[in-house]
Amino acid sequence: MAVTACQGLGFVVSLIGIAGIIAATCMDQWSTQDLYNNPVTAVFNYQGLWRSCVRESSGFTECRGYFTLLGLPAMLQAVRALMIVGIVLGAIGLLVSIFALKCIRIGSMEDSAKANMTLTSGIMFIVSGLCAIAGVSVFANMLVTNFWMSTANMYTGMGGMVQTVQTRYTFGAALFVGWVAGGLTLIGGVMMCIACRGLAPEETNYKAVSYHASGHSVAYKPGGFKASTGFGSNTKNKKIYDGGARTEDEVQSYPSKHDYV
């Protein structure tokens, strides 16, 4: 039961995480104009991975896509790549994990196959989460560097009468969404890997041992004993539920004392 719970929870956590990674990647607020000294601004700038936007105090918002590929900073391209790799791996991981779920029966798939699929999806989730965290962190580092550079520029070259206000950018909401989502995907992946250990049928075949007693020759030959961690399903007491299909939600809503195979 605990294996099913761990696997199910890992799947759900990863699902939320990957949804968050997708949301973060699509969000426009990766960097937002720093409103130091000025909480109410007439023109507010914010930028995403794909476009930059300007919101005026009139309520008018204009967004412009980055229609160039070669003209973009290498770091931005790297962040885009990391986020896309994270999404792709996460999506594949989700697909694999659906079939690996213990509560879903597909043909006569053995536990060993489900265990392998669970491990595969878990590793994919871990890598996906790491990609997202790395992407967001690279972008954040880029922001911090640019922030201090623009701060330095603000106080230099102001010998003349005319001042030019340098727009400084700080962390946008997407960065926090990305960090949290990456973390959730990572946690979900770890949970899947832990669940895999419980699913894996550890075959420990004990050899027949002969005990020679005087006068009698009695051999005790126990059958192939399947070691159980306490989480796996007992092969002799397997209960196959064929009384109608159950959705995953129903499984979570109405837990049974039996494990679902």
Epitope: E56, F60, Q163
Partner: antibody, heavy 115, light 113 residues
Framework: EVQLVESGGGLVQPGGSLRLSCAVS?????MNWVRQAPGKGLEWVAW????????TYADDFKGRFTISRDDSKNTLYLQMNSLRAEDTAVYYC???????????WGQGTLVTVSS | DIQMTQSPSSLSASVGDRVTITCKSS????????????LTWYQQKPGKAPKLLIY???TLESGVPSRFSGSGSGTDYTLTISSLQPEDFATYYC?????????FGQGTKVEIK
């Protein structure tokens, strides 16, 4: 079509108070109050986000003037306290539009501060 | 606060003349986010409310005749009336629309010569 109609102007003694109203019809995201002293130029007074109620003021009016709105009545207000002779002007309400330009203006209401 | 300085404060011109009004800001009005200059031009006739002519320094408001044009970037801006018409005799104001507090120029009065 947006229409703005101001009211509430009149004669008030120095130190007195007055509340100007601006009846708004049509879509308005944010609004301003702008004033013009007789024979002088335009002077921006205050801005308000009509949805959040977030205001901002010109330095000369902070603490004395309060911009607000009533969603139910679709009305913009300017509460003016501690009025001085130099506050004598025509007060306009104006809608902020694309490029932060003011595209629709009311007809203006005259406020005279005199003893 | 951003100071706006208009010149000249008044000018006399005849119908059909090309008129140029300049406006200088104490700070750049160019927004790096969209590369647009947040400068607005208004026309005001005596006893009337101002009328929006140009926003983003050069974008003509709908319904405004094409003889009006705006140009400039950073701190220097210009309003040009290519061929002055009788209804164009009025006072023109430039406005900082980039940051609060919004500030206006002192105005340029265009009179009949």
């Amino acid at each position: 079509e947006v229409q703005l109609v101001e009211s509430g102007g009149g004669l008030v003694q120095p130190g007195g108070s007055l509340r100007l109203s601006c009846a708004v019809s049509g879509y308005t995201f944010s609004m301003n109050w702008v004033r013009q002293a007789p024979g002088k130029g335009l002077e921006w007074v205050a801005w308000i986000n009509m949805y959040t109620g977030e205001p901002t003021y010109a330095d000369d009016f902070k603490g004395r003037f309060t911009i607000s709105r009533d969603d139910s009545k679709n009305t913009l207000y300017l509460q003016m306290n501690s009025l001085r002779a130099e506050d004598t002007a025509v007060y306009y309400c104006a809608r902020l539009s694309k490029g932060n330009g003011m595209d629709y203006w009311g007809q203006g209401t005259l406020v005279t501060v005199s003893s | 606060d951003i100071q706006m300085t208009q010149s000249p404060s008044s000018l006399s011109a005849s119908v059909g003349d090309r008129v140029t009004i300049t406006c200088k800001s104490s700070q750049s009005l160019l927004n790096s986010g969209n590369q647009k200059s947040y400068l607005t031009w208004y026309q005001q006739k005596p006893g009337k409310a101002p009328k929006l002519l140009i926003y983003w320094a050069s974008t003509l408001e709908s319904g405004v005749p094409s003889r009006f044009s705006g140009s400039g970037s950073g701190t220097d801006y210009t309003l040009t009336i290519s061929s002055l018409q009788p209804e164009d005799f009025a006072t023109y104001y430039c406005q900082n629309a980039y940051s609060f507090p919004f500030t206006f120029g002192q105005g340029t009065k265009v009179e009949i010569k």
